[in-house]
């Protein structure tokens, strides 16, 4: 029995729970998901029982090995998986636990602009990047392009200070999770600040 194995999968994709055993006479292998039986295998008896019929088409054993492949992943497949190898040659079953995290492929992140001010020819605002559907474990970074050196900023909020007359800048939000990444539409500093250009002391949402 080894340490817990952490696995990551994407919605619609597949994941393989790796399992090896040198036991000669395996009587049965039992896979469970959050304490619910998933699959029972009897290598010598010749049978594989998939507890829930809807999972039958999703279960596979690559190259006829002990590892279990689960395909057509759904969000609610996330959880704890446990396997026990039972054999009369073992005093107690050989076990392994896995934690599966299933993530969605990220859609295009949405950018909103905070309160904007324009003082002394400098446009100051915040850009906030977020996912519309509240996806989990998303990491945001911002790329600022256009100055001599391109800059990166970590976090969903990007504070902007852009002076009229400077070369235009482009801001792009990058959203990442363990299985995918996506980019916001590029935002140009000049366009962003145009609304506040007429009134040097204006604020707008």
């Amino acid at each position: 029995s080894g340490p817990v194995k952490e696995l990551v999968g994407s919605v619609g994709g597949a994941v393989t729970f790796p399992l090896k055993s040198k036991v000669k006479q395996v009587d049965s292998i039992v896979w469970t998901f959050n304490t619910t039986p998933l699959v029972t295998i009897q290598p010598e008896g010749g049978t594989i029982i998939v507890t829930q019929n809807r999972n039958r088409e999703r279960v596979d054993f690559p190259d006829g090995g002990y590892s279990l492949k689960l395909s057509k992943l759904k969000k609610n497949d996330s959880g704890i998986y446990y396997v026990g190898i039972y054999s009369s040659s073992l005093q107690q079953p050989s076990t392994q636990e896995y934690v599966l995290h299933v993530y969605e492929h990220l859609s295009k992140p949405k950018v909103t602009m905070g309160l904007q001010s324009n003082k002394n020819g400098t446009c100051v605002t915040n850009l906030t990047c977020c996912m519309e559907h509240g996806e989990e474990d998303v990491i945001y970074t911002w790329k600022a392009l256009g100055q001599a050196a391109n800059e990166s900023h970590n976090g969903s909020i990007l504070p902007i200070s852009w002076r009229w007359g400077e070369s235009d800048m482009t801001f792009i939000c990058v959203a990442r999770n363990p299985v995918s990444r996506n980019f916001s539409s590029p935002i140009l500093a000049r366009k962003l600040c145009e609304g506040a250009a007429d009134d040097p002391d204006s604020s707008m949402v």
């Epitope: 295998i41 010598e44 090995g65 002990y66």
Partner: antibody, heavy 120, light 108 residues
């Protein structure tokens, strides 16, 4: 990748014995059952028996008791089958085939076959 | 020993057709049935094990089903390269494992 390479064809006289080999590569030879299967010309398949190279344990089809002896050598990663007291009904192609781990009775990799002809 | 019977020794079909090969066990073998394909001059190739589990790399036009004593092997849309002999085999519990007599699939 998994490969099973069998020895070449044999022409033997009635009453003689023959030993055919199956050299394995690309997988954990000691931990997988190796099967032997007979196929007479134009006929179906007949399971002879299997051996576990890790400890030499064998399971055989009673029909081949006294006819086929299965052995294995871990160091050379080879399985062997000796056929004794040969008669014309032993003329056949003999295959070695590896058992899958998940289903020990299902055979996923097969050798190319060894043709044994018994003729005086 | 358990006897596996494939009632059709030959089956003739056309490319694109659906073909069903049947196999009957002389006693209950649960779902412990494998299907093999053997092309002329070649070794058998495992397609299905435990009645319905497709082996890695086997095209999904090949499917297996059944339990107890009655089993079927289906090719949903026959291709020219499927010309072969198909064998069922029971791998239930204690050996000996036994094979059906084979069904030769011929392309019209």
């Amino acid at each position: 990748q998994v490969q099973l390479q069998q020895s070449g064809p044999e022409l033997v006289k009635p009453g003689a014995s023959v030993k055919i080999s199956c050299k394995a590569s690309g997988y954990a030879f000691s931990n997988s059952w190796m099967n032997w299967v007979k196929q007479r010309p134009g006929q179906g398949l007949e399971w002879i028996g299997r051996i576990y190279p890790g400890d030499g344990d064998t399971k055989s089809n009673g029909k081949f008791k006294g006819k086929a002896t299965l052995t294995a050598d871990k160091s050379s990663r080879a399985a062997y089958m000796q056929l004794s007291s040969l008669t014309s009904v032993d003329s056949a192609v003999y295959f070695c085939a590896r058992s899958t781990m998940i289903m020990t009775g299902a055979m996923d990799y097969w050798g190319q076959g060894t043709s044994v002809t018994v003729s005086s | 020993d358990i006897v596996m019977t494939q009632s059709h020794k030959f089956m003739s079909t056309s490319v694109g057709d659906r073909v069903i090969i049947t196999c009957k066990a002389s006693q209950d073998v649960s779902t412990a049935v494998a299907w093999y394909q053997q092309k002329p001059g070649q070794s058998p190739k495992l397609l299905i094990y435990s009645a319905s589990f497709r082996y890695t790399g086997v095209p999904d036009r090949f499917t297996g089903s059944g339990s107890g004593t009655d089993f079927t092997f289906t090719v949903s849309s026959v291709q020219a390269e499927d010309l072969a002999v198909y064998y069922c085999q029971q791998h239930y519990s204690t050996p000996p494992y036994t094979f059906g007599g084979g069904t030769k699939l011929e392309i019209k």
